[in-house]
Interface confidence: medium
Amino acid sequence: MMTGTIETTGNISAEKGGSIILQCHLSSTTAQVTQVNWEQQDQLLAICNADLGWHISPSFKDRVAPGPGLGLTLQSLTVNDTGEYFCIYHTYPDGTYTGRIFLEVLESSVAEHGARFQIP
């Protein structure tokens, strides 16, 4: 029986050309986090391994920055970045916890600036 829960930023929006922080937090468990994967649909964006540190997928290294913490910063956003993002926490002994974030990248200043974790 797994006890933990993932809190995420939920649905967020940002302007084209801007940046956004994707953030998840694992709570209500003492399980040890061994790795966090960040994925967009079926594409791996980045890995933060407890022992080996960060690895950014080569195809995203120009637009993805590690952190803050176990989060991920997306830069130079395009409309094509709109979609679902997943944080996958690999823990021991519980296994995997997955959180979902939906990002909408807007063409102009109609982005909701009140979204949490957004970089101005």
Partner: antibody, heavy 121, light 111 residues
Framework: QVQLQQPGAELVRPGASVKLSCKAS????????MNWVKQRPGQGHEWIGM????????RLNQNFLDKATLTVDKSSSTVYLQLSSPTSEDSAVYYC??????????????WGQGTTLTVSS | DIVMTQSPASLVVSLGQRATISCRTS??????????MHWYQQKPGQPPKLLIK???NLESGVPARFSASGSGTDFTLNIHPVEEEDAATYYC?????????FGGGTKLEIK
Amino acid sequence: QVQLQQPGAELVRPGASVKLSCKASGYSFTSYWMNWVKQRPGQGHEWIGMIHLSNSETRLNQNFLDKATLTVDKSSSTVYLQLSSPTSEDSAVYYCARERDYYGSSYFDYWGQGTTLTVSS
Amino acid sequence: DIVMTQSPASLVVSLGQRATISCRTSQSVSTSSYSYMHWYQQKPGQPPKLLIKNASNLESGVPARFSASGSGTDFTLNIHPVEEEDAATYYCQHSWEIPRTFGGGTKLEIK
């Protein structure tokens, strides 16, 4: 070397609680999780649950929430599996198995010889 | 819970030939780094013995005729060349989540 010692057999009357033991030696006892696995004759393995040997934190298979209680005695390096209100369905071989953590991917690297539990009046 | 489907349920292989056992999981048990899949051998009256960890890594002391591969949901255990002492039941097991689950087993007979 690592050893997990279990009694070979236990006989219990239906409805009477039973406590199975697993004594560990040959390694740093409190650094691991200990698992319990049930195997009925001619059948596969059913994972019951696991207990951390330093802080007694447990994870249980939901199918065993009302059946199994896991405890640990650090002073004797022994873990226990208590089965409540046993019936003939609980007659099986019960193994303890140490779980080794490898970058979060864990596996059972050492097993006890198993205790054959017979529930009979 | 993750369902582990092993096939075949039983297998008869001639001495020196290849034995192939399949294990399929109801969801992926792999990350980009590891597969949380392990293989055990069990003989009558004995506890299971770890053969392969993390889909393809041979446990220390296990003969090199045992090998395994796979990722995601499809995994395979191979024994080649099969020896008489390999007669046993083989099980796959995942450690992707709680609860851990096992395959139903494949009984290998040598002729």
